[in-house]
């Protein structure tokens, strides 16, 4: 019963990726359940812990340093067999965060992208890393990991996400490691936020008091639609930010969102989209193009929004 | 940032139970486990015990098997430590922290003064 | 259970000396010991833990060292905030156990 029916199955909540100082919980999963068992560390390294020590249903380990880094496995409680335990479980790596500077993320042709295509993620830094690892928020499965390439001082990698679906959707983060430290990984890049749009019915953009206004005018941009969307999002052409807000229902059985602009001062296009608290990086289809236009004086830009949003947080839930 | 936050002190009388909870925030409570600590006036520090949050699995060591019970609510991120049959002797501060199968306390409570008194 | 023994268990500094606290177990502990920092009124904070990890935030001044059954923490500088009882404790076996604590006080 060798490898089989005999082989726990070892895991790791919240995710195999855990931050210097953080904690994780190992489990190890034997025959339909969660029983006794003793737990391995390949390298034999930072293992006074385990030694001679059986785990009841999981195993906390925490906060962690670069020595927890590694590959491990775990035996399951097996009474009558001849050593008491079974075969060794599954090889489960833990990868520890926070080692080295961060890389940079970035998103090929842009962060906001259509269901079906394709993004590439570059992860790049001038720190010399041998490997990149991508991951994404919330995912226990092990990251993705490429070999760094190495061009005029900075090392880089690709990583081809596609074609996309909302399961694909979400809050990515990368890392560098660095030769003989394959599990020690840098701090993590700065959050990057990949939003698939186009799965929904697009809502209605409209402009109070009308799309073409006086210079210094208020301008207020409503989104609005039958669907029951929890937040709208709206962007405006050549701006990397969003603006959201939540979608309040109306008397007519609408979900509306009011984006005031606060005074006009020169025009842009604007679109908006629809989303769920359950999926908030997944879109609705753009809504059409809305153009407003400024009259009299035009000035350099338009004032900054009163609350705008980061490079990421998108996918964050709205409270 | 991470805090747990306990409950407020308690005057009982010998024979009587308590309650002690702490409310962590900051951090996924059920990806650490939690440690409970205490301390009698003037004196060091004395493990009682932990739960792992993960899991509910409670280990108590020896002195303190029996009477003292460890508890969670994950749905509110707390732990509970209840104390039975107090007696004078149980006069301490009782703190929660922060920690698992690996023994090391990274935050702790502000602490809960439980006195026992007839 | 493993007994941990603290010493001195006074220690009385000027501000700016290098001070050193020892912690001796009565079996091999290999390198699973933890160090608290207690000020007065308030809860234990973790300082060191694997003998010389340092926790989040804590001034590089403090420093952990040992192996197998003799343990140190010195803190380099000493300031005056770090008037506190510090605290030993193995985290090898369970039941965890501490040791009896070193006051510290600034003359």
């Known amino acids: 019963l060798m490898g089989g029916q005999d082989k726990p199955f070892l895991s790791a909540r919240p995710s195999t990726v855990v931050p210097r100082g953080g904690h994780v919980a190992l489990q190890c999963h034997y025959r339909r359940g969660f029983n006794n068992f003793m737990l391995y560390k390949e390298d034999r390294s930072h293992v006074p812990i385990f030694h001679g020590r059986i785990f009841q249903e999981s195993f906390i380990m925490g906060p962690v340093t670069p020595a927890h880094a590694g590959t491990y496995r775990c035996r399951g409680s097996r009474p009558h067999s001849l050593t008491g335990w079974s075969a060794p479980s599954n090889p489960l790596v833990i990868m520890v965060t926070g080692n080295h500077r961060k890389p940079s993320l970035l998103a090929h042709p842009g962060p906001l992208l259509k269901s079906g295509e394709t993004v590439i993620l570059q992860c790049w830094s001038d720190v010399m890393f041998e490997h990149f690892f991508l991951h994404r928020e919330g995912i226990s499965e092990d990251p993705s990991r490429l070999v760094g390439q190495i061009h005029d001082g900075v090392s880089k990698a690709n990583f081809s996400i596609g074609p996309l679906m909302p399961v694909l959707a979400g809050t990515y983060r990368c890392y560098g490691s660095v030769p003989h430290s394959p599990y020690q990984l840098s701090a993590p890049s700065d959050p990057l936020d990949i939003v698939i749009t186009g799965l929904y019915e697009k809502p209605s953009l409209s402009a109070q008091p009308g799309p073409t206004v006086q210079a210094g005018e208020n301008v207020t941009l409503s989104c609005s639609s039958w669907s029951s969307y929890d937040i709208y999002h709206l962007s405006r052409e050549g701006e990397a930010h969003e603006r959201r807000l939540r979608a309040v229902p109306k008397v007519n059985r609408t979900f509306q969102a009011d984006f005031p602009l606060g005074p006009a001062t020169h025009g842009g296009t604007y679109r908006c989209f629809g989303s769920f608290r359950a999926l908030p990086c997944v879109w609705s289809n753009s809504s059409d193009p809305l153009l407003v236009s400024v009259t009299g004086n035009p000035s350099s830009s338009w004032p900054s929004p009163t609350e705008p949003s980061s490079k990421s947080g998108i996918c964050r839930h709205l409270h | 940032q991470i805090q747990l936050v306990q409950s407020g002190s308690e005057l009982k009388k010998p024979g009587a139970s308590v309650k002690v909870s702490c409310k962590a925030s900051g951090y996924t409570f059920t990806t650490a486990g939690m440690q409970w600590v205490r301390q009698a006036p003037g004196q060091g520090l004395e493990w009682i015990g932990w739960i792992n949050s993960h899991s509910g699995v409670p280990k108590y060591a020896e002195d303190f098997k029996g009477r003292f019970v460890f508890s969670l609510d994950t749905s509110v991120s707390t732990a509970y430590l209840q104390i039975s049959s107090l007696k004078a002797e149980d006069t301490a501060v009782y703190f929660c922290a922060r920690g698992g199968d690996e023994g090391v306390m990274d935050y702790w409570g502000q602490g809960t003064t439980v006195t026992v008194s007839s | 259970d493993i007994v941990m023994t603290q010493s001195p268990s006074f220690l009385s500094a000027s501000v700016g000396d290098r001070v050193t606290f020892t912690c001796k177990a009565s079996?091999?502990?290999?390198?699973?010991v933890a160090w608290y920092q207690q000020k007065p009124g308030q809860s234990p904070k973790l300082l060191i833990y694997w003998t010389s990890t340092r926790h989040t935030g804590v001034p590089d001044r403090f420093s952990g060292s040992g192996s197998g059954t003799d343990y140190t923490l010195t803190i380099s500088s000493v300031q005056a905030e770090d008037v506190a009882v510090y605290y030993c404790?193995?985290?090898?076996?369970?039941?965890?156990?501490f040791g009896g604590g070193t006051k510290v006080e600034i003359k």
């Open positions: 079996q091999d502990v290999s390198t699973a």
């Open positions: 404790q193995q985290h090898y076996s369970t039941p965890w156990t």
